[in-house]
């Protein structure tokens, strides 16, 4: 593979890596954040960064409760320089083929180039083409939302069903949930799982006369998606007099395989494409976001793009010391590789963001779950944190116990919007939510020592059970409000955090070979399930499971 973007094989070869190891041993592992605050009255001032969005709204990123000091930050920035993170970043923004194993550009950033500045891939300025797709999305979404687009019986569309999986599902699901406040004209439903229950339960609640299906599969060959799409089509035809001419009014394709789309029966005028430089997990900004535009309206979808574009501008233009996503990525490397942390918790204190951790799980783990570097050698260091999360305060009543008192270091991001879309009961709910957001980060940092526990009346063997070690790192992300622009910015922030991690680990964050093997084996086994013969071609466990399944099916 082409490795012209980096001149090192392993991050451990970099001088700053060794330097950080020494710093970790001499001060990192014993550093007390509580003491750092006592030593430096300006710590918060120095370690919080405020991002200003294109619309003037702000997001504050507070890194001050992390296990770092000036020297550690300086060494981490040195590591970023030695790993040439900015070089790889600039190559990405120039449309170079930084996805070396697939020889592709990584250009999701071009999808949110609302300034329409020239952006080139292989000598082609793709800005006019991106703009043209958005015009198509605007026109189509406005026709559907206004009722100008009608179903085969002349009724307006009331429901949209997006059928896709992975990147063709997770992004739109998360964004439509997060921006539910901005909806109102249409209902959206998402079908992803091959489990027949998913499509069956969805079809129970929609009316064929007023439903629009979006089939989201770039190649139009994704097994789960096409199976679900055919089931939806068969259901639709069975309810509408088996007239294939009605399909055109009720199905659109988010795909570039014109031949298969036409074969399916979809009018190719209702085909929304995107290029090979858009990876699935980065595709919510593309035509894959059509369900979002339909749900919240095109103008809000464009604000979502502009919020991400504003973070792109920050990431490309801000010096390393103040570069918010870069710092986020460096902290992740610091915990992962020097503290041995294996996880990363993202807890949104916001019910609208309940699918945000699931979205970030794919973004982070599919990108950086790699063990071979751009130099084609296996890493001798940990990569790819296990990202997890749930909305708080729910999470406080489940896994936060382990975060506070468990044996593992779990670096955590807490996210809150100061202004609620639902400030009910004179903002009582919002104040309770916010108090927990502040309290959890404080509690994780300050902990509670034996002395305090005893002062509160605990005695004997109960004392150690009530001790909190503290010094557990959090990054607090405080937005003004969860708007389309804010959400776009938050996603782009995590995209560039993920990019920074991958650049330092020198892995290709833009392929996903790990999804292939299971798919291939599933095809083989699929054929074996079609007959009644006893299976003996696999290992004893797999044979045993298949045969028991066949007996019970």
């Amino acid at each position: 593979s082409n490795n012209s973007f980096t001149n090192f094989k392993l991050a451990t070869e970099l001088p700053a890596w060794s330097k950080l190891q020494k710093i970790y041993e001499s001060q990192g592992k014993t550093l007390s954040v509580k003491q750092e605050f006592q030593k430096d009255a300006k710590r918060f001032e120095k370690l919080n960064k405020t991002f200003t969005n294109y619309d003037g709204s702000k997001i504050l990123f507070d890194y001050s409760k992390n296990l770092v000091n000036d020297e550690i930050i300086a060494a981490l920035i040195e590591l970023a320089k030695e790993a040439n993170v900015t070089g790889l970043r600039d190559a990405m923004f120039k449309g170079e083929h930084i996805n070396s194993t697939e020889d592709r550009a990584v250009y999701h950033v071009a999808l949110r180039n609302r300034a329409n500045k020239p952006m080139y891939v292989d000598g082609v300025n793709v800005a006019p083409e991106v703009d043209s797709v958005l015009k198509h999305m605007k026109e189509f979404s406005e026709q559907v939302r206004s009722g100008e687009w009608k179903g085969y019986t002349g009724k307006k569309i009331t429901d949209v069903v997006n059928i896709g999986i992975g990147g063709s599902d997770l992004g739109p699901v998360m964004v439509t949930e997060a921006l539910k406040h901005y909806a109102g004209v249409l209902d959206v439903h998402f079908v992803s799982n091959i489990d027949g229950t998913h499509i069956a339960e969805t079809l129970k609640v929609v009316d064929p006369e007023t439903t629009l299906f979006l089939i989201a599969s770039k190649t139009f060959t994704t097994a789960e998606t096409i199976t679900n799409a055919n089931t939806a089509k068969n259901w639709f035809l069975s309810k509408t007099g088996n007239d294939p001419s009605h399909i055109a009014k009720h199905f659109a394709a988010l795909s570039t395989n014109e031949t298969e789309v036409a074969k399916f029966g979809i009018d190719t005028k209702n085909m929304f494409g995107f290029e090979s430089w858009v990876g699935g997990r980065y595709s919510v900004w593309s035509a894959i976001g059509l369900s979002v535009a339909l749900y919240i309206g095109y103008d809000n979808f464009e604000a979502f793009l502009k919020g991400a574009e504003a973070v792109d501008n920050h990431f490309t233009q801000t010096p390393l010391e103040d570069n918010i996503p870069l710092l986020g990525g460096l902290l992740s490397v610091w915990y992962n590789n020097f503290f041995g942390a294996q996880t990363h918790l993202v807890a949104p204190f916001d019910q609208y963001l309940h699918r945000f951790p699931a979205y970030l799980q794919q973004l982070s783990m599919e990108s950086n779950g790699k063990s071979v570097t751009r130099g084609n050698v296996f890493t001798d260091y940990s990569t790819g944190s296990i990202l997890f999360g749930e909305p708080a305060t729910n999470a406080q009543h489940s896994f936060f116990q382990l975060v506070h008192q468990g044996t593992k270091l779990i670096p955590s991001d807490f996210i809150l919007a100061a202004q609620s879309h639902n400030p009910i009961e004179n903002k009582l709910h919002q104040k309770m939510l916010a108090s927990n957001f502040f309290a959890q980060a404080e509690a994780l940092m300050v902990g509670k020592d034996e002395e305090q526990v005893k002062a509160e009346g605990a005695t004997g063997g109960l004392v150690p059970h009530k001790v909190f070690s503290g010094n557990r790192p959090t990054t607090s992300i405080l937005a003004q409000k969860i708007t389309p622009a804010t959400l776009g910015a938050l996603i782009a922030y995590y995209e560039h955090v993920t990019f920074t991690e991958g650049a330092i680990w020198n892995i290709n964050s833009f392929d996903q070979w790990g999804v292939e093997l299971g798919k291939v084996l599933a095809k083989v086994i699929g054929k074996e399930l079609d007959n009644s013969s006893t299976i003996s071609t696999h290992d004893a466990s797999t044979n045993g499971l298949i045969n028991q399944f066949k007996e019970w099916m």
């Epitope: 000598g123 395989n257 014109e258 031949t259």
Partner: nanobody, 118 residues
């Protein structure tokens, strides 16, 4: 910048053949429906043939069975094979690129002259 450059035109006798080529640069060629149009003196520009991103073709009635449109995505080129040419095929032939997945994104070539005369 975007360029569509036609070539292959010329003078040919009735019943003869010509092959027009249109080389595109500066566009994501595989994402465009490519078409040939023609304009005879004093007449409007008419569609001759087009080919979609997936290779589906469409022809004007007057050229069906005589003309064949094809594309080579690796070479960013679209072709028009013209057989059994007639004097009424005399015109300037233009190449057109229409972005298949969007709206309002169309490019034209400068045209190449085809003259069918004995």
């Amino acid at each position: 910048q975007v360029q569509l450059v036609e070539s292959g035109g010329g003078l040919v006798q009735p019943g003869g053949s010509l092959r027009l080529s249109c080389a595109a640069s500066g566009i994501s060629f595989g994402s465009y429906t490519m078409a040939w149009y023609r304009q005879a003196p004093g007449k409007q520009r008419d569609m001759v043939a087009d080919i979609t991103t997936g290779g589906r073709t469409n022809y004007a009635d007057s050229v069906k069975g005589r003309f064949t449109i094809s594309r080579d995505n690796a070479k960013n080129t679209v072709y028009l094979q013209m057989n059994s040419l007639k004097s009424e095929d005399t015109a300037v032939y233009y190449c057109k690129a229409d972005f298949a997945y969007g709206r309002d994104l169309t490019y034209w070539g400068q045209g190449t002259q085809v003259t069918v005369s004995s």
